[in-house]
């Protein structure tokens, strides 16, 4: 249940999240499967952990192999595992099967290309992008963030893509690249102003104080494909990533496309350990395309814990 | 309501085996951790067993190699297997909720079944 | 293991008179979280235990406010300001640091 296949190129750094999350205030400990033996914390090593993340600056494919981390949680020490497999660099220009990263599919009104893992990185824009191994060069082509546009798509703008980025650690850099098939879809779609499904205008959620809150932003967006889409969160009008407070988090759901054909998004906005404070703070759902923006403000206000189970009745 | 079940107790001779269910309503049994505790007449409460929610499972040296504790989560339901049982193992058994193992949220083991009672005798 | 220990064994109390419980752990009981996973559980006769205290000092749903948690690192004190008669029963401490262990029990009954 808590484990997870991940795969680099020596010579390049790879980064691993632990498959068994926990609070961030939590230690977690690696350890080398096979020999129990721990795993360093100290960044001088080529291999070390660092929370819930276990790096390989560089990798070698000697360090392929399953390792375990364990989170040191109450109650339980939690146990995931990471299956590692490091190989060796292509000396053409194929790219195997067991390297790529989940196909993606885009049309003429939606062409973004994601760079997969990138999040788990220290990475400055901008990525380079690479099709078939060639470098991608012309105007139809734009690096955005941790995504590759493509405009006008049209059939032969279908597969494979690397993207190319560089990883920083404390001053050193190390390369990465990750490859992606690209597929293209002949759709009949069409794009019109955001309509928010949740939440609602001005809802009222109820949250407990010290537990962990959830706020989903779910937008449609027509039929089809989107060109330019996007829902996010904002706190008091500021962006989540500018907001500075490390609890509060939004996650990217996954596209939807309903029974009826509506493209529709979601973003996830988790709060963990809900403070008093984040009850004074206004929670604005945006949804966003080429016809205009749409906002849903939602408030917080405490919930008093069920009283699953009265003692004295 | 918030609700543990436990069935499954009796008389069983030494050497033999036992399996206790534990039926739970009233809450997303998935995402609890969940335990089973035992009392020996006139004794204190000792930890059995337990389970998170991804199914992994622990014990004390007393149980561990013996008693095996599982969890079928579509069916809201806890089991404790008790294999070669000794008379040092008569005691009622309580199934309880642990922390939410999802959210990493403790309030303490709070939610008790009513007991069934394991008699291990010749 | 975590080993707890509870004093007194056995506590004869006046209804209306306060009443003090001591909980100590062999080794601190502070997680990185912030929290002390210490908890208090009430078994009245013929019942099953009754979730008190959680986490040192947060009273659970539907206890009255008598009852009071504190305490720190390896010592923690359960108190109730006036005994009731429905108070009578076998006190526990738990730890839920690591797996759980239960103390010995505090016997509490009416003189």
């Known amino acids: 249940k808590f484990s997870k296949q991940s795969w680099g190129l020596e010579n390049e750094a790879l980064i691993v999240r632990c498959p068994r999350q926990g609070k961030p205030s939590y230690t977690v400990d690696w350890y080398y499967s096979q020999t129990n033996k721990s795993i360093p914390t100290q960044e001088r090593n080529r291999v070390f952990a660092s929370g819930q993340l276990l790096k390989f600056l560089p990798a070698e494919v000697a360090d392929s192999g399953i390792y375990t981390c364990i989170v040191r949680s109450p109650t339980f020490n939690r146990t995931g595992y990471a299956n590692v497999t490091i190989y060796k660099k292509q000396s053409d220009c194929n790219v195997p099967d067991y390297l790529m990263y989940s196909t993606v599919s885009g049309s003429e009104k939606n062409s973004k290309i994601y760079c997969p893992t990138i999040d788990l990185y220290n990475w400055t824009a901008p990525l380079e992008w690479f099709k078939n191994c060639q470098a991608l060069q012309g105007s139809r082509y734009r690096a955005h963030k941790s995504f590759l546009v493509i405009d006008n798509v049209m059939t032969e703008d279908a597969g494979d893509y690397t993207c190319k980025f560089i990883h920083n650690e404390n001053g050193a850099n190390y390369s990465v690249t990750a490859t992606r098939s690209f597929t293209v879809k002949d759709e009949q779609g069409f794009s019109l102003f955001p309509v928010i499904g949740a939440p609602a205008q001005n809802e009222i959620k109820e949250v407990e104080i010290g537990k962990n809150a959830n706020l989903t932003c779910s937008a449609c967006f027509g039929k089809g494909t989107q060109f330019l889409a996007a829902v996010l969160w904002q706190l008091n009008g500021t962006k989540i990533t500018d907001f500075g407070e490390p609890r509060i988090q939004q996650e990217e759901g996954q596209n939807q496309s309903f029974s009826n054909g509506l493209a529709c998004l979601d973003m996830v906005l988790r709060i963990a350990d809900v403070k008093e404070e984040d009850l004074l703070l206004q929670y604005d759902c945006l949804a966003l395309n080429l016809h205009g923006l749409r906002r849903h403000t939602v408030r917080l206000s405490r919930k008093n814990p069920i009283d699953h189970h009265s003692i004295y009745c | 309501e918030v609700q543990l079940v436990e069935s499954g107790g009796g008389l069983v001779q030494p050497g033999g085996s036992l399996r206790l269910s534990c039926a739970a309503s009233?809450?997303?049994?998935?995402?609890?951790?969940m335990h089973w505790i035992r009392q020996a007449p006139g004794k204190n409460l000792e930890w059995v067993s337990a389970?998170?929610?991804?199914?992994?499972?622990y014990y004390p040296g007393s149980v561990k190699g013996r008693f095996t504790i599982s969890r079928e989560d579509a069916k809201n339901s806890l089991y404790l297997q008790m294999n070669s049982l000794r008379a040092g193992d008569t005691a009622v058994y309580y199934c309880?909720?642990?922390?939410?193992?999802?959210?990493?949220?403790?309030?303490?083991?709070?939610?008790w079944g009513q007991g069934t009672t394991v008699t291990v005798s010749s | 293991d975590i080993v707890m220990t509870q004093s007194p064994l056995s506590l004869p109390v006046t209804p209306g008179e306060p009443a003090s419980i001591s909980c100590r752990s062999s080794?601190?009981?502070?997680?990185?979280?912030?929290?002390?996973?210490l908890d208090w559980y009430l078994q009245k006769p013929g019942q099953s235990p009754q979730l008190l205290i959680y986490?040192?000092?947060n009273r659970a749903s539907g206890v009255p406010d008598r009852f009071t948690g504190s305490g720190s690192g390896t010592d923690f004190t359960l108190k109730i300001s006036r005994v009731e008669a429905e108070d009578v029963g076998v006190y526990y401490c738990?730890?839920?640091?690591?797996?759980?262990?239960f103390g010995g029990g505090t016997k509490v009954e009416i003189k």
């Open positions: 309880a909720r642990g922390g939410d193992g999802y959210n990493y949220d403790y309030y303490g083991i709070d939610v």
């Open positions: 009233g809450f997303t049994f998935s995402t609890y951790d």
């Open positions: 389970i998170d929610l991804a199914g992994d499972t």
């Open positions: 080794q601190s009981l502070l997680h990185s979280d912030g929290y002390h996973y």
């Open positions: 986490l040192g000092s």
């Open positions: 738990m730890q839920a640091l690591q797996i759980l262990t």
